[in-house]
Structure formats: C-alpha cells, structure tokens
C-alpha cells in the first residue's frame, strides 16, 4: 500500500470527510478526471488539482496534528506527479506563486503574452489551417 | 498574423509593458517553458500559465478600453490551448474556480484525495518499482 493512503485516511478524520454525505452534489475532481483520457489533457486538469491541494495544505501548515500526513502526501505527489524531478516541482511552484495583483508581475505577463501564445499549441498542431478548422467545435 | 498579436500589442500599451525594463530580473513564464520539451510536462506548466492569464483578465473585466483585446486573446487561447473544445475549457474553469477556503470544498477534496492520488501517475508508469526508483532524484 502506498504511504499516502494511511495519511489520507488520517486527513479524512481531521476534516470530517469520511461521511457519505460529503459526496452529495457531485464530485470536485473525480468526475472531471473521468472525462479526459489523453495524457496531455489529463495533465492540464491534474495541474490545477495538484495546485489546489498544495494551496489547501499551505493553509494548514501550522496545524501540527496533521503535519506528518500532509508532508507524506506532498512527497508522494512529488513522486507520482513530478516524477521526483525537483526542477519540475520548483518551476510549477514558481508559477503557482505569482501574484496576479502585483503590478510588476502584470507588466511582465503582458510583455510575454505574444510569445506564450505562440507556444500554446502542441508542435504538431501549429499549422494555421488546422487551427482554423478547430474554431467550430463545441 | 494571428488575431491575438494586434490585441496583445494593445494590452502592452495599456499596461505600459512595452519598455525593455519590463524584462529586468528575468522572465515569468518564458524561461520556465524553455525548460520543458515533453508535451505532458509543457501542459503541466501551461495549465498554470493559462489560469494566471484568465485570472488577470477577470480582474480587468470592467475596463471597457481593453475588453475587445481581452476577449480576442481569450478566444485564441481557447483555440490554441483547449483545441476549441468547450467541455475541456469548462472543466478547466471549474477547477480554477474552486475556493480553497470553502469548508465543503475542503471536505470534498480530502474525501477524493486517495482516488486522485491513484490517478496521478501516467498509466505506463504506475508500477510501484518504477516509482520507488524516483524517490532519490533531485
């Protein structure tokens, strides 16, 4: 059994998240993940999910009673999602930590926008014709 | 020329982001994107970058002078990054809109954690042995 399972059960107790009523009104993440089978699509969604958990854990960083559980889960996320590549995790965390209200960050983001947009399409899909075909799909 | 280019230039003027000094102290996104060639790694990073721009644009949604530019750029992001797939964009936006301080959201997130973790590794890399190898890389 992966180390995170026991620690996640501990968090369930702490957050009172074990009851069946928690599942009322649908899921947050699981339903969305079920929609996407392509690896690159899954990464788009999982990137947001992992950053959500990191933010959640950050909010409870001073709560000693769950520190070990949180650290174990974060480490296992690092192994599973970032393939234990610290550079990947560091770059990810830099991106999640940029403040959207910081004026210098705003200026930089707008300054880089054209180049960022140019890189958004996967390499195989950069043909203009291909993109214009895409405009009409729901 | 893609439609976003002219509109991004318009935003540069609005944000006073055309000056060379904006590039001082390194880039926000471009340096990070340069580090990642694998499509799935790029999607992890681009997911955070796109959500940053969406948040930034949301903060300026009431500013009429840049509305057309913002809408054009968002639409082009939809074409390029979400492949004009509305379901993909909708799922993405759901994820970005969850509030990490909402108690019900917290409980649901912790309730789903074990299943989310189980799905984090790419299908081909779920072997326990492969993952344990990864524990020791920087």
């Amino acid at each position: 059994q992966d180390p995170y399972v026991k620690e996640a059960e501990n968090l369930k107790k702490y957050f009172n998240a074990g009851h069946s009523d928690v599942a009322d009104n649908g899921t947050l993440f699981l339903g969305i993940l079920k929609n996407w089978k392509e690896e690159s699509d899954r990464k788009i969604m999982q990137s947001q999910i992992v950053s959500f958990y990191f933010k959640l854990f950050k909010n409870f960083k001073d709560d000693q009673s769950i520190q070990k559980s949180v650290e174990t889960i974060k480490e296992d996320m690092n192994v599973k999602f970032f393939n234990s590549n610290k550079k990947k995790r560091d770059d990810f965390e830099k991106l999640t930590n940029y403040s959207v209200t910081d004026l210098n960050v705003q200026r930089k983001a707008i300054h880089e926008l054209i180049q960022v947009m140019a890189e958004l399409s996967p390499a195989a899909k950069t043909g203009k014709r291909k993109r214009s075909q895409m405009l009409f799909r729901g | 020329q893609d439609p976003y280019v002219k509109e991004a230039e318009n935003l540069k003027k609005y944000f006073n982001a055309g000056h060379s000094d904006v590039a001082d102290n390194g880039t926000l996104f471009l340096g990070i994107l340069k580090n990642w060639k694998e499509e799935s790694d790029r999607k992890i990073m681009q997911s955070q970058i796109v959500s940053f721009y969406f948040k930034l644009f949301k903060n300026f949604k009431d500013d009429q002078s840049i509305q057309k530019s913002v809408e054009t750029i968002k639409e082009d992001m939809n074409v390029k990054f979400f492949n004009s797939n509305k379901k993909k964009r909708d799922d993405f936006e759901k994820l970005t809109n969850y509030s990490v301080t909402d108690l019900n959201v917290q409980r649901k997130a912790i309730h789903e954690l074990i299943q989310v973790m189980a799905e984090l590794s790419p299908a081909a890399k779920t072997g326990k042995r492969k993952r344990s190898q990864m524990l020791f890389r920087g």
Epitope: K86, K87 | F136, R137, G138
Partner: antibody, heavy 120, light 111 residues
C-alpha cells in the same frame, strides 16, 4: 555540524561478503534519504544505492542489484550496505552520502570513505 | 540511458577564468537539475554547485554554474583561479529512468 563516518571496509576474497556502516550525526537522520557512492582507484564516481528516510524504499544500480542490500537503523542513526558475492570490480572507496529533496538532489555531505579491496 | 561527457582535463594560469563543460548525450539538459562536485586529491567530493547555478554556503562566488539548452550542456566556470582550485570536477544529473548519472570527471590543473 553534519558528520558521516564510514567503517567496515577491508580486504576480502572474490565471492566473499562485507558489511559497511555509516554513523551519522548533526542532523535528523530519519528525515533524509541516504546513498552510497563508490569510486574505483583512479576512476570516476559511480552511484551504488539509496534508501528513503523511513527505510521503506530502496534502489540499486544495475551493477550491484541482487548482491548488495542497503538498510538503515534510525534509532542508531546508522546506514548500512551489506555486500555479498563480491567481485574484483567492486574494489573502490565507498562513500556514505546525505542528500535532501530540498537541496536539488545535490549530494550535500559526503563521508571520508572506506576502502573495499576484492582480491585473491 | 544518457551519458554526461566532460573534457578529460583543462589547465589555466592563476587569476584567469576556466570553464568546464558537461554535455548530455540524450534527453534535455534543462529538464533536470545539474550538480557539480569538486574532489581534491586524497579527499572526499564536496558540492560546489547544485540546482544548475546555486552555490552552497562556504563556496566562493568565483564558482558559477549555467545551462545552455542549445548545446544541451552545462558549464562550471571558475574565475580568478587559485592554486587550491586544482582538483577533479564532476557534473551529475538524472532523468525519469536513471536516478543519477555522473560525468567522467575533469582534471583541472592550475599552471
């Protein structure tokens, strides 16, 4: 101050066994993954084995897989390398190395090394 | 598996600047951190650069590390060379299937 002190090296015949130890001090031992790296005489560095802080996960280089076993005793702040079926090509200085995920995978602290000679 | 290739030896006079390269054979150099280790004769290795360009405390700022994606290589630059810099220098990195790989080492001679 971090200290890593290896012991247990020596001369052994091909096919024989040795157990290396590394006594650690100056840091919270159980919080860190530990590794063994070796260096044959006049040659470069070669990573041998690693173990997680809890001891629950281990990994080995192909060249030693099935012959070497890494372990740790967190109550004694000690790392071990059990080496069986030794070969001439295992002759090297063996370094005990502390590393941390939060220092970018750099091998931050190295012991002084213990010499293992496999010869008949 | 990939390899990291370093020059066998380099030499330079005291006070000058020397650069040691480390070229990755396959995979992308920038997608994983590179470390550099110094090993003086008869001593254990010590880290002089980690995470591409960061110096551990105690390592002088004469030592700097960099990555060049276009040549798929990392570099260690030592400026203001001193006799005590004479040592072997090793680069090290990893990828998704190989936990750690060391370069073959470069012998730096200070003339």
């Amino acid at each position: 101050e971090v200290q890593l002190l290896e012991s247990g090296g020596g001369l052994v015949q091909p096919g024989g066994s040795l157990r290396l130890s590394c006594a650690a001090s100056g840091f919270t031992f159980s919080s860190y993954a530990m590794s063994w790296v070796r260096q044959a005489p006049g040659k470069g560095l070669e990573w041998v084995s690693a173990i997680s802080g809890s001891g629950g996960s281990t990994y080995y280089a192909d060249s030693v897989k099935g012959r070497f076993t890494i372990s740790r005793d967190n109550s004694k702040n000690t790392l071990y390398l059990q080496m069986n079926s030794l070969r001439a090509e295992d002759t090297a200085v063996y370094y005990c190395v502390k590393r941390s995920f939060d220092s970018g995978g750099s091998f931050e602290y190295w012991g002084q090394g213990t010499m293992v000679t496999v010869s008949s | 598996n990939f390899m990291l290739t370093q020059p066998h030896s380099v030499s330079e006079s005291p006070g000058k600047t020397v650069t040691i390269s480390c070229t990755r054979s396959s995979g992308y150099i920038a997608s994983s951190y590179v470390q550099w280790y110094q090993q003086r004769p008869g001593s254990s290795p010590t880290t002089v650069i980690f995470e591409d360009d960061r110096r551990p405390s105690g390592v002088p700022d004469r030592f700097s590390g960099s990555i060049d994606g276009s040549s798929n290589s990392a570099s260690l630059t030592i400026s203001g060379l001193r006799t005590e810099d004479e040592a072997d220098y090793y680069c090290q990195s990893y990828d998704d299937t190989t936990p750690w790989v060391f370069g073959g080492g470069t012998k730096l001679t200070v003339l």
